[in-house]
């Protein structure tokens, strides 16, 4: 999703870490919307 | 030219913080991450972390997690890392880097000196 | 932690002579591409780094060709054919293959 980014090389070396951090974070943030959806 | 200019020389006291800016030209600032190393005095150079300023995706060394913040203001093509908590140990030059698509610091700012001191 | 070990840690010299300086990793650098991201970094007296050479031997802009880089594995060596002196200084070397990316201690080179 970062056409531009792509010729940096640091894009290359965390590309796969950068992933595992976002779907980290939306499964932590989709925990939490569960968690406030339970206590409503 | 690609040209990366830092914020001044700052001292502050234990248990503060402190926020160094990184303003970034002559290229397109969303082309490219934004790292941070520091330097301490008769240390090596140490790779605190790395922002990705089109979604502001962070990546940090697990060494300041939690101590170190990351951050971008694309309208101002300027970076800056804020370290809180800060120790004698945090005194240390801090460098903000940009790298290419072949090596990743190859431009680096002048340097910011944060000493911690009581 | 990839530990880079930087020899020796002080390397005294005569100008036009050559320099070499050997950096060895903790384990090997090779990406899972297979490329080895092995980096020189020079730091002169009150400057920031300047990077040098990329991806073990590839020299960056502006770099004159009396610095060259070589190794493989976990063995680096950077060699300077004829120490001129603006190349006094600490030189650097980094690894980007493996996360934490780290910096050898360094190797400061210096008027025999």
């Known amino acids: 999703d970062n056409p531009s980014l792509s010729i940096d090389l640091t894009f290359h070396l965390l590309r796969t870490l950068l992933e595992l951090a976002r779907t980290q974070s939306q499964r932590e943030r989709a925990e939490q919307n569960r968690i406030i959806f339970d206590s409503v | 030219q690609v040209q990366l200019v830092q914020s001044g020389a700052e001292v502050k006291k234990p248990g503060a913080s402190v926020k160094v800016s990184c303003k970034a030209s002559?290229?397109?600032?969303?082309?490219?991450?934004m790292k941070w190393v520091r330097q301490a005095p008769g240390q090596r150079l140490e790779w605190m972390g790395v922002?990705?300023?089109?979604?502001?995706?962070?990546f940090y060394n697990q060494k300041f997690k939690g101590r170190v913040t990351i951050t971008r203001d694309t309208s101002a093509s300027t970076a800056y890392m804020e370290l809180s908590s800060l120790r004698s140990e945090d005194t240390a030059v801090y460098y903000c880097?940009?790298?290419?698509?072949?090596?990743?610091?190859?431009?680096w700012g002048q340097g910011t000196l944060v000493t911690v001191s009581s | 932690d990839v530990v880079m070990t930087q020899s020796p840690l002080s390397l005294p010299v005569t100008l036009g002579q050559p320099a070499s300086i050997s950096c060895r990793s903790g384990q090997s650098i090779v990406h899972s591409d297979g490329n080895t991201y092995l980096e020189w970094y020079q730091q002169r007296p009150g400057q920031s780094p300047r990077l040098l050479i990329y991806?073990?031997?590839n020299r960056f802009s502006g770099v004159p060709d009396r610095f060259s880089g070589s190794g493989s594995g976990t063995d680096f060596t950077l060699k300077i054919s004829r120490v001129e002196a603006e190349d006094l200084g600490v030189y650097y070397c980094?690894?980007?293959?493996?996360?934490?990316?780290?910096f050898g201690g360094g190797t400061k080179v210096e008027i025999k």
């Open positions: 002559g290229y397109t600032f969303t082309d490219y991450f």
């Open positions: 880097a940009r790298g290419t698509d072949r090596a990743l610091f190859a431009y």
């Open positions: 991806k073990v031997s």
């Open positions: 980094f690894q980007g293959s493996h996360i934490p990316w780290t």
């Open positions: 922002i990705n300023p089109n979604n502001a995706d962070i």
